[in-house]
């Protein structure tokens, strides 16, 4: 129309899909009568009437926004209920009286799109690929307008480089309206991007501002070859024998490569392949001596068949050898001294001990132990340990037992044993000596013999309680060929008043086994023995 | 549209080669990757080997020294060989393609099934 | 390597049925998972991708949930021409199928 003025720039409402765009008509009072006021979609420059005022009353036209729109604010805002994307339009709305003006607004329509979905390559990427790799994928679900995708490498954003990154997206529309985002991160990858972290960013706006939402990050699996290979064993330090030993082999690609390990041979310095488990580690449970040398791992590439060998490592396992005493099995005479001697090989220092077996009292620190004018306590067993100390646990122990000559020596002179008539009872006698004694019983009953050791032997006598019986008691008697000696047992009647413990005899009905501690002796033989002492 | 169509034997003998053929229409092979899948039957799926849009290898562990995949560009195919077959191979094999923006499989032919026997 | 467990391996269920498939992974593998049916003779066609993302094409009553170790696919209310095998696909770390779900009618 000649002289009238161009239109000014629509007025921008802006509004979150599935929100209230208020669409307030601007025009004056000299413009127009806004209780009187028609307002139109403008779709692809074709007007579409869609609300009618008249008297400040609204009526909707039918058609796409009938349900949806509403006065407000005393007629002078329209009110667009559940925005979706195809609202974005320009809405005008016209006065009738005095003359026919319009005043135009711009919706713009926002939504947020989800989180992005990142995907990483499942396969992995090799380093030598030709040109650049599917690397990881991005999806940005229902937004609105589209929003830009910016690919990130440990927090830096990539760029498109030729050969080496290119950055692949595209966007479907959904049926809503909205916009799905797809993109693909293709990049020539390197070593070191093993542990790099990728994450794909999704920038949107809002009527708030800008905004942004980040994928979580991704490694990729970058496969590379191998360029080193090395053997590591488990445990670290010392090793001994009896330790479980991993010899693991290493190298530096990815996927590893197949592995084999070979030990040294001393004699033909020819290497011996070894058998290793299915992860390709060789484990030795448990370890021997043997089992030093000198290793080595190949590795193979099995596409190229081109093979890596690592630095030989040696392997010590530290060893104790059996112990040897001498002499064996030492036999002496009371008063007479003895000297015991040990003897062991180890791959380190060696340390020895001799300690009394019953006690464990170290007696000499040393491998040669002397022992002077030797009574007939200093029988029993002597253990030579022999121990490298900058191993702990590394040791091996020999037992040698001493035997001293006497006659039988009782564990108990006499002693009484309450009893009932009529009961079959169980007697037990203990003597020792060298040699080693045999036992007999004045009374008839069931007996058996047994060997606590080769100077000490136990007898057992089932025997039925009768009058005789409880008024002779019952001898057992001890001989070897150095002479006898006797322990008597006093059988008493058990009544009410004897079940009182008394300190000096063995109450109950209980076996009648003799104590080893309190020992008791005579002898028959004209040989003068010492004193007994209290063992143990 | 898109299409995947397998070809080879439907018979192999134990111990000899298997080569399968996969042409594919409607997507070029430098735009997506093909996977082979096998399923034997009354069985569940496998993946065997694939080749991405950038012409990388992929092989399945289990068979990798028997497999190799190749493909020509000029002609949409991708080819799966495989050596020293044995009676467990006997399965439908199938070639799938990778979709673009994504790690699974949008399109799959129909499938062939090789039977191995002597 | 990754093992893909289903439950059930089978199930009887009628016309109109809600169902549910499970899928265990035996890691994390995040969201990186598909659901594809077999029919008897054809090629296995996806259905989900991405745990929950719906294949184009597919009807509305499929629907795929979970992420990291356990997932589920359900059916809302089963079709005639829903009864078919069902397997799962991780795509985290390489590809593994699950043994697959024979759903029958009942």
């Known amino acids: 129309v000649p002289g009238e003025a161009e239109q000014p720039a629509p007025e921008l409402v802006e509004v979150e899909v599935g929100s209230t765009a208020l669409l307030k008509c601007g025009l004056s009072q000299s413009q127009g009568n806004l209780s009187h006021v028609d307002w139109f979609s403008v779709h692809k420059e074709k007007r579409t009437l869609i609300f009618r005022v008249r008297q400040g009353q609204g009526q909707s036209e039918p058609g796409e926004y009938e349900q949806r729109l509403s006065l407000q604010d005393r007629g002078a805002t329209l009110a667009l209920t559940q925005v979706t994307p195809q609202d974005e339009r320009i809405f005008l709305c016209q006065g009738k009286r005095p003359r026919s003006q319009e005043y135009r607004i711009q919706l713009r329509v926002y939504k947020a799109p989800e989180e992005p979905n990142i995907q990483v390559n499942p396969l992995g990427i090799p380093v030598n690929s030709k040109e650049p790799e599917e690397v990881a994928t991005c999806v940005g679900r229902n937004g609105y307008p589209i929003p830009q995708v910016i690919w990130y490498k440990n927090g830096r954003p990539l760029k498109e480089e030729k050969n080496r990154v290119h950055i692949q997206s595209s966007q479907t529309v959904e049926s809503s309206g909205l916009y799905t985002l797809q993109s693909i991160l293709k990049a020539q990858l390197v070593k070191e991007d093993k542990d790099a972290q990728f994450y794909c960013e999704l920038n949107y706006r809002l009527p708030s501002g800008n905004h942004m939402k980040e994928s979580r990050e991704v490694t990729v699996p970058v496969f590379y070859p191998t360029e080193k290979v090395w053997l590591e064993v488990e445990p670290v330090g010392m090793l001994k024998e009896g330790d479980r030993v991993e010899i693991r082999c290493l190298a530096d690609g990815n996927p590893p490569p197949h592995f084999s390990i070979s030990k040294g041979n001393p004699s033909t310095r020819e290497a011996e392949e070894e058998t290793t488990n299915d992860n390709g580690v060789l484990v030795l449970e448990p370890a021997r001596k043997e089992h030093s040398g000198r290793y080595e791992c190949q590795a193979w590439n099995l596409d190229t068949m081109i093979s890596l060998l690592s630095e030989p490592q040696e392997l010590l396992v530290n060893y104790v050898s059996d112990v040897r005493v001498s002499p064996a099995a030492p036999e002496r005479q009371e008063g007479s001294s003895l000297t015991l001697t040990c003897e062991a090989e180890s791959s380190q220092d060696l340390e020895f001990q001799w300690l009394r077996e019953e006690t464990d009292q170290v007696l000499e620190r040393g491998p040669v132990l002397q022992l002077h004018d030797l009574k007939r306590e200093a029988g029993g067993g002597y253990r030579c340990v022999a121990s490298v100390p900058s191993i702990p646990g590394l040791n091996r122990t020999q037992l040698v037992k001493l035997a001293i000559f006497g006659p039988p020596w009782m564990a108990f002179k006499e002693r009484k044993v309450w009893v009932k008539e009529n009961m079959v009872l169980n007697l037990s006698c203990e003597a020792s000596g060298h040699p080693r004694p045999t036992i007999s019983w004045n009374v008839n009953g069931t007996a058996s013999e047994g060997d606590q050791d080769p100077q000490r032997v136990l007898s057992t006598l089932n025997v039925l309680v009768t009058p005789e019986l409880l008024e002779t008691g019952v001898e057992c008697t001890a001989s070897n060929d150095l002479g006898k000696n006797t322990s008597i047992l006093f059988l008493e009647l058990v009544n009410l008043t004897t079940l009182t413990p008394d300190s000096n005899t063995t109450t109950g009905l209980s076996t009648s086994t003799a104590s080893p501690h309190t020992r008791a002796n005579s002898t028959s033989t004209e040989r003068k023995l010492p004193e007994p002492e209290s063992r143990g | 549209q898109v299409t995947l169509k397998e070809s080879g034997p439907v018979l192999v003998k134990p111990t000899e080669t298997l080569t399968l053929t996969c042409t594919v229409s409607?997507?070029?092979?430098?735009?997506?990757?093909v996977s082979w899948v096998r399923q034997p039957p009354g069985k569940a799926l496998e993946w065997i080997a694939a080749i991405s849009s950038g012409g990388t290898t992929y092989y399945n562990s289990a068979f990798k020294s028997r497999l190799t995949i190749s493909r020509d560009t000029s002609k949409s195919q991708v080819v799966l060989t495989m050596t020293n077959m044995d009676p467990v191979d006997t399965a439908t094999y199938y070639c799938?393609?990778?979709?673009?923006?994504?790690?699974?499989?949008?399109?799959w032919g129909q499938g062939t099934l090789v039977t191995v026997s002597s | 390597d990754i093992q893909m467990t289903q439950s059930p391996s089978s199930l009887s269920a009628s016309v109109g049925d809600r169902v549910t498939i499970n899928c265990k992974a035996s890691?994390?593998?995040?969201?990186?998972l598909a659901w594809y049916q077999q029919k008897p003779g054809k090629a296995p066609k996806v259905l989900i991708f991405n745990a929950n993302s719906l294949q184009t094409g597919i009807p509305s009553r499929f629907s795929g949930s979970g992420s990291g170790t356990d997932f589920t696919l359900t059916i809302s209310s089963l079709q005639p021409e829903d009864f078919a095998t069902y397997y799962c696909q991780q795509f985290y770390s390489g590809y593994t199928f699950g043994q697959g779900t024979k759903l029958e009618i009942k």
């Open positions: 799938a393609r990778r979709y673009g923006y994504g790690w699974y499989f949008d399109f």
């Open positions: 890691q994390n593998i995040y969201n990186s």
């Open positions: 409607g997507f070029s092979l430098t735009s997506s990757g």
